[in-house]
């Protein structure tokens, strides 16, 4: 009888011997539970599972409190994994995150945190980085320490308002806070002066919409 | 979409005044607050005056109190900046900014400049001795 081999991450695609990008099944250590999640196997070495993409607009991310825990989107494309997978994973061993960012110019940035990790849907996800390193700001754009994920129909923010109707996605909002890579997308020469566009306050400032952005993470061993 | 358009900068001498207006289009003030700042060659921008009319609160700057005074007319949809008894260290370029009204941590009064997410191109303010 053949061995069923399963896969919690990138990483251990890759290390298996599956270098190629592409979207991979991945499965939780005593978990039935499938997910679909591209796999970048070049940048940085490889191994990174993407838990967010966002690039053309054609993914509504303005999204209920369960389709970000379970996740949405085209992994191909535009897509947010899924809190609780994300949640799980994190919790199981040191993980880093890598946020990368296009403009509407031409330039690319990233931010990278050494330590990574979502905290249980009781406790609402809670987002908790440390070591912040990278070319999209000194400061990080993700409000510190660590705020709630907040939805359209669960505000956990710390905002008289309620940051995810009034700014659009789900997000770790403050009130509201210096980023929200879940916002509305907008084109090109429309990207700006947005009180709801995707930002990254840190890199590009206040008002700029993004033309794209990527979230992923690889176990801090790697 | 929205627009902010600053105007009424220019030379002026020591202990002079000038009126800055910044008007706005794509959204009425009712719903936002306006903020000016400035910016001064190689320094950092910084807070000057904020107004919100959904209750009439004004904010000022500690080095601008007394001097400056903030007002809006809903009709043009235009916030002005007063400025008197100016001085050399008030040169900068001068910007205002809109927020949301609403967008306010609980407990708090103002906002921080990452939450202004409209800002117009601003004006130069040259004060000579």
């Known amino acids: 009888k053949e061995e069923q081999i399963s896969f919690r991450d990138c990483a251990e695609v890759f290390k298996s011997g599956h270098t190629t990008n592409g979207v991979y099944t991945l499965t939780l250590p005593n978990s039935t539970e499938e997910v679909k999640a591209y796999c970048d196997m070049e940048a940085g070495g490889g191994g990174w599972t993407i838990i967010q993409r966002r690039e053309d607009g054609s993914v509504d991310f303005q999204r209920t409190w369960k389709e970000y825990k379970v996740g949405f989107g085209n992994p191909s494309g535009e897509y947010w994994l899924g809190n609780e997978f994300v949640s799980q994973l994190t919790n199981q061993q040191r993980y880093v995150l890598k946020i990368h960012l296009k403009d509407w110019e031409g330039n690319e940035a990233y931010s990278l945190y050494e330590h990574f990790y979502l905290s249980s849907e009781e406790l609402n996800y809670r987002i908790h980085l440390k070591g912040l390193t990278g070319t999209a700001g000194k400061i990080s754009s993700i409000s510190q320490p660590g705020n709630d994920f907040s939805t359209k129909d669960a505000d956990n923010d710390k905002c008289i308002c309620k940051c995810s109707q009034m700014l659009t996605g789900g997000w770790w909002f403050d009130a509201c806070g210096p980023s929200n890579l879940n916002g509305m997308y907008y084109p090109q020469r429309q990207n700006t002066n947005k009180f709801n566009g995707i930002k990254w306050y840190y890199w590009k400032g206040s008002g700029y919409s993004l033309k794209g952005t990527t979230m992923m993470i690889r176990p801090a061993d790697f | 979409e929205v627009q902010l358009v600053e105007s009424g900068g220019g030379l002026v001498q020591a202990g002079g005044s000038l009126r800055l207006s910044c008007a706005a289009s794509?959204?009425?003030?009712?719903?936002?607050?306006i903020g000016w700042f400035r910016q001064a060659p190689g320094k950092e921008r910084e807070g000057v005056s904020t107004?919100?009319?959904?209750?009439?609160?004004?904010y000022y700057a500690d080095s601008v109190k007394g001097r400056f005074t903030i007002s809006s007319d809903n009709d043009k949809n235009t916030v002005y900046l007063q400025m008197n008894s100016l001085k050399p260290e008030d040169t900068a370029v001068y910007y205002c900014?809109?927020?949301?009204?609403?967008?306010?941590?609980?407990?708090?009064?103002?906002?921080?400049?990452?939450?202004?997410?409209?800002w117009g191109q601003g004006t130069l303010v040259t004060v000579s001795s």
């Open positions: 107004i919100r009319d959904s209750d009439g609160s004004t």
């Open positions: 794509g959204f009425t003030l009712d719903d936002y607050a």
């Open positions: 900014a809109a927020v949301p009204a609403g967008r306010l941590r609980f407990g708090e009064q103002w906002y921080p400049l990452y939450e202004y997410d409209a």
